[in-house]
C-alpha cells in the first residue's frame, strides 16, 4: 500500500549497536501530516509497533527500555498521512552486544609497528564462532567481517595489515558472532592500541570499495591486505 509519500528517516539513539540491558530509542521522522507511525521488524508478521506522532507530528518514538536478543534485527518504519501510507524508510539494523563472552584481541608481532611493515591483528574466542568483526574507534565505516566458509566454526580470525601506514594507527576492538544472527555480537574485546611509528607522509592504502572523495583518513574502511587467512575464514566488507 506504499504510496507516493516520501520515505521517513529511521535512526536509533544512542546508536544502533547496543549492549545487553541498555536502553535504546528508535525514532521515525516523517512529515507534519503524519497521523500514525508504524515500525516493522523483519520476520515479524504483525506491525512490530505503532505510535501516535509526537507534536509537531513529524516524528514518533519507539522505546526499548532494556535491550535483549529479541530486539536485535532489521527494522523499517512508515507513516500514514491523510492520503495513505508512505514508502518504507531505509532499514535500521539494531545490533546487540553482550550475547557471548568477550574475545581476546592481540597484535602480531607487536602493537608497536613501523610504517611500511606488516602487522596482524588476532581475534580469539574461547568457544568456536563463525564470524569475527574488527572495529576501529572513530571510523565512519568501522566494521570488517571475517566469516567462515560453509559454517565452519573457528576459535580465531586473523586481520593482516600490510603495508602499515599512519592511517592504521588507533584503538581497535573485536567481536565474535554466530552466523545464525549477525545482529547478536559478543561482548567487545579489551581495546588494543596500534601505534605506528615512522613518517607521517606515508601513502594511504588504496581502498577496495568506493568512498566519498571528501572522506578523511578516519573515514576510510579498514584495509587489511595480503592473503586470506589460513583459518578458513573469508573476508567480507559489510
Amino acid at each position: 500500500q506504499a504510496g507516493p509519500l516520501p520515505k521517513p528517516t529511521l535512526w536509533a539513539e544512542p546508536g544502533s549497536v547496543i549492549s545487553w540491558g541498555n536502553s535504546v530509542t528508535i525514532w521515525c521522522q516523517g512529515t507534519l501530516e503524519a497521523r500514525e507511525y508504524r515500525l516493522d521488524k523483519e520476520e515479524s508478521p504483525a506491525p512490530w509497533d505503532r505510535q501516535n506522532p509526537l507534536e509537531p507530528k513529524n516524528k514518533a518514538r519507539f522505546s526499548i527500555p532494556s535491550m535483549t536478543e529479541d530486539y536485535a534485527g532489521r527494522y523499517r518504519c512508515y507513516y500514514r498521512s491523510p492520503v495513505g501510507w508512505s514508502q518504507p524508510s531505509d532499514p535500521l539494523e539494531l545490533v546487540m552486544t553482550g550475547a557471548y563472552s568477550k574475545p581476546t584481541l592481540s597484535a602480531l608481532p607487536s602493537p608497536l609497528v613501523t610504517s611500511g611493515k606488516s602487522v596482524t591483528l588476532l581475534c580469539q574466542s574461547r568457544s568456536p564462532m563463525d564470524t569475527f568483526l574488527l572495529i576501529k574507534e572513530r571510523a565512519a565505516h568501522p566494521l570488517l567481517h571475517l566469516r567462515s566458509e560453509h559454517g565452519a566454526q573457528q576459535h580465531q580470525a586473523e586481520f593482516p595489515m600490510s603495508p602499515v601506514t599512519s592511517v592504521h594507527g588507533g584503538t581497535y576492538r573485536c567481536f565474535s558472532s554466530h552466523g545464525f544472527s549477525h545482529y547478536l555480537l559478543s561482548h567487545p574485546s579489551d581495546p588494543l592500541e596500534l601505534i605506528v611509528s615512522g613518517s607521517l607522509e606515508d601513502p594511504r592504502p588504496s581502498p577496495t570499495r568506493s568512498v566519498s572523495t571528501a572522506a578523511g583518513p578516519e573515514d576510510q574502511p579498514l584495509m587489511p591486505t595480503g592473503s586470506v587467512p589460513h583459518s578458513g575464514l573469508r573476508r567480507h566488507w559489510e
Epitope: 497521523r35 500514525e36 515479524s44 508478521p45 504483525a46 509497533d49 529479541d70 498521512s81 491523510p82
Partner: antibody
Framework: QVQLVQSGAEVKKPGASVKVSCKAS????????MHWVRQAPGQGLEWIGE????????NYNEKFKSRATLTVDKSTSTAYMELSSLRSEDTAVYYC?????????????WGQGTTVTVSS | DIQMTQSPSSLSASVGDRVTITCRAS??????LNWYQQKPGKAPKLLIY???RLHSGVPSRFSGSGSGTEYTLTISSLQPDDFATYYC?????????FGQGTRLEIK
C-alpha cells in the same frame, strides 16, 4: 474459523485485582494485535489498550495505564488483561478483540465477554 | 483524545425502512471510521471498516459513507435482525475511541 474464547465471570472486592484470559484459535495468534475493550452496564464501549502478541509491545489508554497490564502467552495463544486496584466503577463486561490492521484499524473478531463484578 | 458523537442516541423504525445513523469526530479522522452492531448480552460485531468497506458476511443492505469528521451508516431496508445498538469507532489515532451508541428499536 477465528474464535476468541474468554474466561468466566469474576466477582471481586474493591482493591483486589482481576485477570481475564482470551484464548485465540483459527488464525496465527502472533500475526494480529489484540485489543481489550470494556462496557459498563447500560453504557458504551471503552478501549483499554492493545498488545502485539509476537513481541509484547503495548499501547494503553492513559486512563488505564497505571492499573491495566496486558500480556500474552504465545505457547497457548492466550492474551491476558489484568486490572488492579479494582473499584465499583470497574464493574463491566470485558472483551478481547482482534485487530484487522489495515485501513480502518478495526476490531474484526470479538470474544464473548467476561463479566467482572466489583462489590464489597 | 478524539471524541466521537453519534446521533441520534436512539431511534424507532419499522421493518423495510431506510435508516441513517451519523457519527461526528472531534477532528479529521481520515476515513479511519468503523461501525459495529451489538445485541443485548452479546459481543459487538464489525459491520463496516474504513468508512465504507463491508466486513465479510455482512449483508449488502448495510453501507457507510463520509469523510473528514462526518460519517454515516445506512441500512437500506431494515430487517427484523437489524434491531440492535450501533457504535462507531475511530482508528485514526491512539487511544481508539467509540461513539456512545445508537439504539435502534422497532416502532
Amino acid at each position: 474459523q477465528v474464535q476468541l474464547v474468554q474466561s468466566g465471570a469474576e466477582v471481586k472486592k474493591p482493591g483486589a485485582s482481576v485477570k481475564v484470559s482470551c484464548k485465540a484459535s483459527g488464525y496465527t495468534f502472533t500475526s494480529y494485535w489484540m485489543h481489550w475493550v470494556r462496557q459498563a452496564p447500560g453504557q458504551g464501549l471503552e478501549w483499554i489498550g492493545e498488545i502485539n502478541p509476537s513481541n509484547g509491545r503495548t499501547n494503553y489508554n492513559e486512563k488505564f495505564k497505571s492499573r491495566a497490564t496486558l500480556t500474552v502467552d504465545k505457547s497457548t495463544s492466550t492474551a491476558y488483561m489484568e486490572l488492579s486496584s479494582l473499584r465499583s466503577e470497574d464493574t463491566a463486561v470485558y472483551y478481547c478483540a482482534r485487530d484487522r490492521y489495515d485501513e480502518g484499524n478495526a476490531m474484526d473478531y470479538w470474544g464473548q465477554g467476561t463479566t467482572v463484578t466489583v462489590s464489597s | 483524545d478524539i471524541q466521537m458523537t453519534q446521533s441520534p442516541s436512539s431511534l424507532s423504525a419499522s421493518v423495510g425502512d431506510r435508516v441513517t445513523i451519523t457519527c461526528r469526530a472531534s477532528q479529521d479522522i481520515t476515513n479511519y471510521l468503523n461501525w459495529y452492531q451489538q445485541k443485548p448480552g452479546k459481543a459487538p460485531k464489525l459491520l463496516i471498516y474504513y468508512t465504507s468497506r463491508l466486513h465479510s458476511g455482512v449483508p449488502s443492505r448495510f453501507s457507510g459513507s463520509g469523510s473528514g469528521t462526518e460519517y454515516t451508516l445506512t441500512i437500506s431496508s431494515l430487517q427484523p435482525d437489524d434491531f440492535a445498538t450501533y457504535y462507531c469507532q475511530q482508528g485514526d489515532t491512539l487511544p481508539r475511541t467509540f461513539g456512545q451508541g445508537t439504539r435502534l428499536e422497532i416502532k
